[in-house]
């Protein structure tokens, strides 16, 4: 179902419209938005009373509301992924049109603790009770609904339209009818304030078509912050009634002439404005011309005024409004300056912390200090940063380049370093031979030895077995060893898992689940594989299997 404007209340610089219709919060916001507004804010008790008034107006005209407890959307929502925050008055919710986290709230009950779902707020009206200013509608949060499924008891919504100013309603000095058409497409004949850019159609007379006169006016900005219709004198005046009809349309005093004509006047301390109807205070500060926290200060003899701003603010070009002074323009901070309303604060770049001589100074954070180093092995502090390095036989690893990963020399870029079997160890490696072969003195080659069906020479020693579990090479793997590149190992290594470079089939290794620890490695049993078949850490779900190899000389750690 669509939504119809049923009621409108204009006050201050805003108009509130109430609509009936079972719409989702998104559909309701879209409806308000199409006419230049948003779902209504309720940022204060006063605003809550304005909203209550427009809802009361709607309910007087609306006979067919289906639920005793009716709900009307307002513009308070919490986006998907934003958690309920019990420490804030708005509990993590925010106004759809933007704006600060206001202190006023009127929650119906304790809120549901959630983060995943988008949540929306409606005003809860008990239609069995009269709407009283002392009993303002409570805020109820819940799912935001969807087209065709607005949510339980949703009966409508309230929009808010903001304007730079308002005109006073047109004053009729005799019989007639005024029809206002607002910029948000509402027509009304009774507004206590009429928004800027509204049109007024005035039909004078008592319904006799021959006597009807029509006038058309537009609410314009006559001067900064001064809005009027550009009409002069009361409308629809009639000698028949004089001052007796609606006080002649005058704001304060009405003075009749003997011929049935009349004039408007003002009480002491007030003056008649150009429309010859309205009275304004002679004290120029009484109309509160200053905005944005500015104070109105009367000039000599009370004739004019100036606006004064609090510390940290200055007058804008209109000389009526206060704007924040950007203290950061004077560069008062050593590194980063953040301008704040009425002041500023200094911040330090990543890798620095407040300290050192002078106001707003920053000093380097020593990331490598005892107990604070992010690096697995070597750490070098630099100005504003740090970098990690690894011992020989390890390369930098991890997303942020702070971890060290053992280099598997057995599957290095130059192919196997050993003639036959290669055993990788933490930080090193060593060579071994198949049954029936023995390791030559150079520690790399294999020579024919006494025939044996035992395990390959150079099995993992006892000390290592607990760390990387080994298994013997299958007996079927008796192919002659293939020659690897010439050369000697870089150290006399201890043993660990073997990797056989041969034509033997590749065997997959079962994963050994371990109790979780701070820096788990990839644990696998020894496997027979071709020179190209390197098993290693598997790609995480959705991750990237490529690992950039980094030099041992270190790299900048990410902060």
């Amino acid at each position: 179902t669509g939504a119809d404007t049923e009621a409108v209340v204009c006050v201050g610089t805003a108009c509130y419209t109430a609509h009936s219709g079972k719409l989702s919060a998104a559909e309701a916001q879209n409806h308000c938005n199409q006419n230049g507004g948003n779902l209504a804010t309720v940022k204060s008790k006063e605003e809550a009373q304005h909203v209550q008034r427009v809802l009361a107006q709607l309910l007087r005209r609306e006979a067919a509301l289906t639920a005793r407890m009716s709900k009307f959307w307002i513009g308070l929502q919490r986006e998907k992924g934003k958690c309920l925050d019990p420490s804030l008055p708005l509990k993590g919710f925010s106004w759809v049109g933007g704006g600060e986290d206001t202190p006023y709230s009127n929650w119906h009950k304790e809120l549901r603790n959630s983060c995943i779902s988008k949540r929306c707020v409606s005003l809860l009206l008990d239609l069995s009770q009269p709407l009283l200013p002392s009993r303002l509608p409570k805020w109820s949060e819940g799912p935001c609904g969807s087209p065709g499924s607005p949510g339980s008891n949703i009966e409508g919504f309230v929009c808010k339209f903001s304007f730079k100013g308002m005109c006073r309603p047109l004053a009729l000095g005799g019989p007639g009818q005024v029809t206002y058409t607002t910029p948000f497409q509402t027509t009304s004949s009774s507004l206590e304030a009429v928004p800027f850019a509204s049109a007024a159609n005035v039909a004078c007379g008592e319904g006799d078509k021959d006597e009807t006169q029509s006038h058309y006016f537009l609410c314009k900005e006559k001067a900064p912050d001064v809005f009027d219709w550009g009409s002069s004198g009361p409308l629809c005046v009639s000698p028949k009634y004089g001052c007796n009809f609606n006080n002649g349309g005058c704001h304060q005093d009405c003075f009749e002439g003997g011929d049935g004509s009349f004039l408007c006047g003002c009480r002491p301390g007030f003056r008649l404005l150009d429309d010859l109807v309205t009275c304004a205070s002679r004290n120029p500060c009484s109309s509160s011309p200053c905005r944005g926290g500015a104070t109105c200060v009367l000039g000599p003899h009370g004739k004019n005024y100036t606006c004064r701003c609090p510390q940290g603010y200055q007058l804008d070009s209109s000389q009526l409004d206060c704007v924040d002074v950007d203290e950061c323009q004077d560069s008062p901070c050593a590194q980063e300056c953040v301008n704040t309303p009425g002041g500023f604060r200094c911040e330090c770049w990543v890798g620095y912390e407040p300290g050192g001589p002078g106001e707003g100074a920053c000093q380097d954070v020593d990331e490598c200090a005892l107990g604070r180093s992010p690096c697995a092995q070597g750490c070098t502090n630099t100005d504003g940063s740090f970098h990690c390095s690894c011992e020989e036989g390890y390369v930098l690893a991890g997303e942020d380049g702070t971890q060290c990963q053992d280099v598997d020399e057995c599957v290095g870029p130059g192919g196997p370093l050993c003639d036959s079997l290669c055993f990788n160890t933490q930080g090193s490696f060593h060579c071994g031979c198949l049954p029936g072969w023995v390791l030559a003195p150079n520690g790399v080659s294999c020579t024919m030895g006494p025939v044996s069906l035992g395990p390959p020479s150079g099995p993992p020693d006892e000390e290592d077995k607990g760390e990387k579990e080994g298994s013997t090479v299958p007996r079927a793997a008796t192919a002659s060893p293939t020659r690897g590149p010439e050369g000697t190992p870089k150290a006399t290594p201890t043993t660990s898992r073997p990797s056989l470079s041969s034509d033997a089939p590749i065997t997959s290794a079962p994963l050994k689940m371990l109790a979780p620890s701070g820096s788990p490695g990839v644990w696998r049993e020894p496997s027979i594989h071709h020179a190209t078949a390197a098993s290693g850490p598997q790609e995480p779900a959705g991750g990237d299997s490529s690992v950039a190899t980094q030099n041992n000389d270190g790299t900048d750690g990410q902060k």
Partner: antibody
Amino acid sequence: QVQLQQSGAEVKKPGSSVKVSCKASGYTFTDYEMHWVRQTPVYGLEWMGGIDPETGDTAYNQNFKGRVTITADKSTSTAYMELSSLRSEDTAVYYCTNYGNLYYYAMDYWGQGTTVTVSS
Amino acid sequence: EIVLTQSPATLSLSPGERATLSCRASSSVSSSYLHWYQQKSGASPRLLIYSTSNLAFGIPARFSGSGSGTDYTLTISSLEAEDVAVYYCQQYSGYPLTFGGGTKVEIK
């Protein structure tokens, strides 16, 4: 008191799917979101995603590239996590968890864990 | 996503000693959204401290937490044998929630 009871251990072949259940008791099922976290020796604890049982709305960790589906059955107060296109690195302990009456995603309640082994 | 780096990977201390565990975030995290968990061998993780410094129900007062921005600390004022476990930090500042790699606390 709040209890989260998970289904038993599973052994699966690579390429297949696994569906782990988590039956909640001791509270109104639709009051709290339900989340899934897995633990592997290589990657430690990884948040997979969560569901709001009241609305059925879900949030997922994009690292799982659409392989995870979380559902909830209000009638049986049970949440489910299905992981498809299994590979060996999905071998892990899978936990359901929620934050009960606490705020800011502080996971107060955990299931006992379900071990899923992916092996050919 | 925000990466949490815990240090040291392993902490070996004698009973009665003070344990200080660090959790560093790759970008700033609201202190309300930084939590610590304890996981003993073969058990599920257990909430230890929520919102940086609040003790979860049933957690002894020797545990405390502090920090802000990118640097957070879990302290065990006087280590006991029953505190042997792996400790994880966790944050939320938009999906995905992430955990640190853990710090293993053992008795010397």
